[in-house]
């Protein structure tokens, strides 16, 4: 699996997740979380070269197609395949909140 | 949506579905495939700035991080939404069979 | 087994103090933010304190402010709730909630009933 496991234990340059980290008010100016500062929510990149974890089977197509016409621009893409929530603390007024945010975390990548 | 009503009509630069015809025997050697002799699998590309068609949480941050770190390397990446089947003709020996193989055809697309 | 026990509620004075404990096992505790809730009859539950890890500061519901004071070893894997200056509005049952930052896992513990009353 293209996972944080096996990703972020090689040097891989096809389609893997890689590490990214995000803090809520210097990289998006989100200033209303107030907790954490920060988290990993990671990002999927590199090539899909065929049958590399293909999602269906159009991207099966797609990394056949691209395989034999390599000048073609349709390819598949690295994109999230599992992800996770993210647990914050926010203000309503002067009441605080803690809320959980699905599919924050990318914790896999699929070629789609 | 960005899907074949609108992106075949229109000259959209960002993410949306394109036209691709795929020759089955030309384009991906696959002899045993008797009808149709090939088909539009389409395919997905173009940028996908902040917002546009954000598939979850994750790709709506990614976005808005990479239009406000528009150095970084992390982006959302315009994949397929909604596949459809395709019915083929081929033979087992000398009996032919009539089958649907799944996800075959790019519908629409989204920032994943 | 994951498991959230709570204790040191009790019935206690106007303007007393009590110590609420919370200790958790089962799971890695260093992970999770701790918060403590409450919910008075009749009412909804809600936040009273948080704490995030590995060293966010506390966040409390304006009520408590300056009386209400939470903290956390790690190492114990439990979360305290310190109660001074008790006012019969805190009278309540206080949960210890502890949810996972990064992933999924969100637990409870059972309860513990604090009466503020002369």
């Known amino acids: 699996a293209l996972d944080t496991n096996y990703c972020f234990r090689n040097l891989e340059e096809n389609c893997c997740v890689r590490p990214l980290y995000i803090d809520f008010r210097q990289d998006l100016g989100w200033k209303w979380v107030h907790e954490p500062k920060g988290y990993y929510a990671n990002f999927c990149s590199g090539p899909c070269p065929y049958l590399r974890s293909a999602d269906t089977t159009h991207s099966t197509v797609l990394g056949l197609y691209n395989t034999l016409n390599p000048e073609a621009s349709a390819s598949p893409c690295c994109v999230p395949q599992d992800l996770e929530p993210l647990t914050i603390l926010y203000y309503v007024g002067r009441t605080p909140k803690v809320e959980q945010l699905s599919n924050m975390v990318v914790k896999s990548c699929k070629c789609s | 949506a960005l899907d074949t009503n609108y992106c075949f009509r229109n000259l959209e630069e960002n993410c949306c579905v394109r036209p691709l015809y795929i020759d089955f025997r030309q384009d991906l050697g696959w002899k045993w495939v008797h009808e149709p002799k090939g088909y539009y699998a389409n395919f997905c590309s173009g940028p996908c700035p902040y917002l546009r068609s954000a598939d979850t949480t994750h790709s709506t941050v990614l976005g808005l991080y990479n239009t406000l770190n528009p150095e970084a390397s992390a982006s959302p990446c315009c994949v397929p939404q909604d596949l459809e089947p395709l019915t083929i003709l081929y033979y087992v020996g000398r009996t032919p069979k009539v089958e649907q193989l799944s996800n075959m055809v790019v519908k629409s697309c989204k920032c994943s | 087994e994951v498991q959230l026990v709570e204790s040191g509620g009790g019935l206690v004075q106007p303007g007393g103090s009590l110590r609420l404990s919370c200790a958790a096992s089962g799971f890695t505790f260093s992970y999770y933010v701790a918060s403590w809730y409450r919910q008075a009859p009749g009412k909804e539950r809600e936040l009273v304190a948080t704490?995030?890890?590995?060293?966010?500061?506390?966040h409390y519901a304006d009520s408590v402010k300056g009386r209400f004071a939470i903290s956390r070893d790690n190492a114990k894997n439990t979360v305290f709730l310190q109660m001074d200056s008790l006012k019969s509005e805190d009278t309540a049952v206080y949960y210890c909630?502890?949810?996972?930052?990064?992933?999924?896992?969100?637990?409870w513990g059972q309860g513990t009933q604090v009466t503020v009353s002369s």
């Open positions: 909630n502890a949810r996972r930052v990064e992933g999924h896992g969100i637990y």
């Open positions: 704490t995030f890890p590995p060293d966010g500061s506390p």
